[in-house]
């Protein structure tokens, strides 16, 4: 329970203004009314409160809104947002992109990735899906934030907005997120010509299945090694040496540099050594000549 102190008459607060910066923590607790604070939230960010004072103001809002803040308060949080935990944010219902922009600006330069991820999640839930306006806001104010969304949330992305996503927006996306985004991108770019298609689809290839990689290998795409290294391990392993050579084109030489790193290392272990030797790169670790490869996983699947 909170230790209660009475507000001295001369310290009574009738409006939220600059005079409050001179109040001690106990005085703020006793004298600032949470309902008044909520009604005048638009004034708070202009007042240079200390972090300790902001703590008190946060506790006041928590007192007033135990089930989470309404958007009328959230949009005016300003630097008070820095005091919020992901658990606090999870209680919010946010639909306004102006609110999202304001809070993304505040969070810049602070270690708040968990809070920002939760905020974006709440916006997507509040708006029903990750629509084009939300995606545009994220790419403009928080590059990389798209990848903070769960695969479940990303599944609501309509293919029509994929075109607005830039390569750098996907830099921090994990395999499960790319698994969701890749089919949408494939659909979005399906009417493009070969080279144009590859440029567009490249950032999403971390979610591509083996069949699509095989198809790409027939199109002289010359995939760069950075993109290859982001491909799903399971998608790369079934590719033959010839297919990888066609896929990478002149970049195939980079395999030597990456031969100790996944997925290259794992792929090498699956190839016949004499096939690897045809590349002339000195890649070692393939299956020795004369060895028979039994794929037990296939037998298990059949039995």
């Amino acid at each position: 329970d909170v230790e209660r102190t009475t507000c001295p008459p001369e310290k009574e607060v009738h409006e939220i203004d600059e005079s409050l910066i001179f109040y001690k923590k106990r005085e703020l607790e006793a004298c600032v009314d949470a309902a008044l604070l909520a009604a005048q939230m638009d004034r708070v960010d202009a007042i240079p409160f200390t972090y300790e004072q902001l703590d008190v103001l946060k506790h006041k809002l928590d007192e007033l809104y135990p089930q989470g803040y309404p958007e009328s308060v959230i949009r005016h949080l300003g630097h008070l947002f820095l005091k919020m935990s992901p658990e606090d944010i999870r209680k919010w219902n946010v639909t306004s992109l102006e609110t999202l922009k304001a809070l993304l600006k505040v969070s810049k330069g602070h270690e708040m990735s968990a809070q920002v991820a939760t905020l974006i999640d709440r916006v997507v839930v509040g708006r029903g899906q990750l629509d084009k306006d939300t995606a545009d806001t994220l790419t403009a104010f928080c590059p990389g934030c798209l990848c903070s969304l769960s695969p479940e949330r990303l599944s609501s992305v309509p293919p029509s907005i994929i075109g607005a996503v830039r390569p750098q927006d996907l830099d921090t996306c994990g395999p499960r997120q790319l698994d969701v985004l890749y089919p949408k991108a494939r659909l979005a770019f399906q009417n493009m010509s070969g080279s144009e298609y590859f440029v567009k689809i490249r950032p999403f290839l971390g979610g591509a299945p083996t069949e699509d990689l095989k198809a790409l290998s027939q199109q002289n795409v010359s995939m760069d090694l950075a993109t290859f290294m982001k491909l799903r391990r399971e998608a790369v392993l079934p590719l033959s040496v010839a297919e990888v050579q066609k896929l990478l084109g002149p970049h195939v030489e980079g395999l030597k540099v990456e031969e100790q790193h996944s997925p290259v290392r794992d792929w090498i272990l699956k190839q016949r050594q004499d096939d690897l030797d045809t590349l002339g790169l000195g890649l070692q670790g393939g299956i020795p000549n004369g060895y028979l490869i039994l794929d037990l996983s296939v037998r298990e699947a059949l039995s």
């Epitope: 329970d1 006793a30 004298c31 309902a35 009604a39 506790h59």
Partner: antibody, heavy 119, light 108 residues
Framework: EVQLLESGGGLVQPGGSLRLSCAAS????????MSWVRQAPGKGLEWVSN????????NYADSVKGRFTISRDNNKNTLYLQMNSLRAEDTAVYYC????????????WGQGTLVTVSS | EIVLTQSPGTLSLSPGERATLSCRAS???????LAWYQQKPGQAPRLLIY???SRATGIPDRFSGSGSGTDFTLTISRLEPEDFAVYYC?????????FGQGTKVEIK
Amino acid sequence: EVQLLESGGGLVQPGGSLRLSCAASGFTFTHTYMSWVRQAPGKGLEWVSNISPTYSTTNYADSVKGRFTISRDNNKNTLYLQMNSLRAEDTAVYYCARYNAYHAALDYWGQGTLVTVSS
Amino acid sequence: EIVLTQSPGTLSLSPGERATLSCRASQSVSSSYLAWYQQKPGQAPRLLIYGASSRATGIPDRFSGSGSGTDFTLTISRLEPEDFAVYYCQQHNQYPNTFGQGTKVEIK
């Protein structure tokens, strides 16, 4: 079901004291702002006071400041209004009301208790 | 303090007619913090409208609220016999949380 039940009203002489109570049920009292509103006979509503749930921050109308004290007992789910130095103009029906912070309005009211200040 | 002035003081209308009640504030009030209440003789007030325009639970859609800044309106589109009562506006924008003096809607 939300219920607010006021008690403690009655006849008191000018200068006297009275303590009103409001028993609350059907909601989480410990999370809720509570208010007192009064209505003089044949007149309109007048906001009297309110109190916050955790810090027990209080606010008063100028007409009662220094004479009335609002308080609460979160363990008993009860709101109080201690009225001292009563005047004839304090004669009114006193309502206890729940403040809904999400609506910024008084969404539930008690039936009221009549306080008569007369000699 | 914010003074809320309601007009007219009394509105004499017949059932089925439209009622328009006004609430004017002496200084700007955020629409999120303006509410309307209905009170019938011998009863406690009842919340009708909060946030200037949102109907409280169980309130029929013939009641609507509008306005911003200093001018707010409560409209009853078609008066029913049970709507004849006194109506109050209230602001929670700053302390004290003042009420208007009320508008009585009576049967003509």
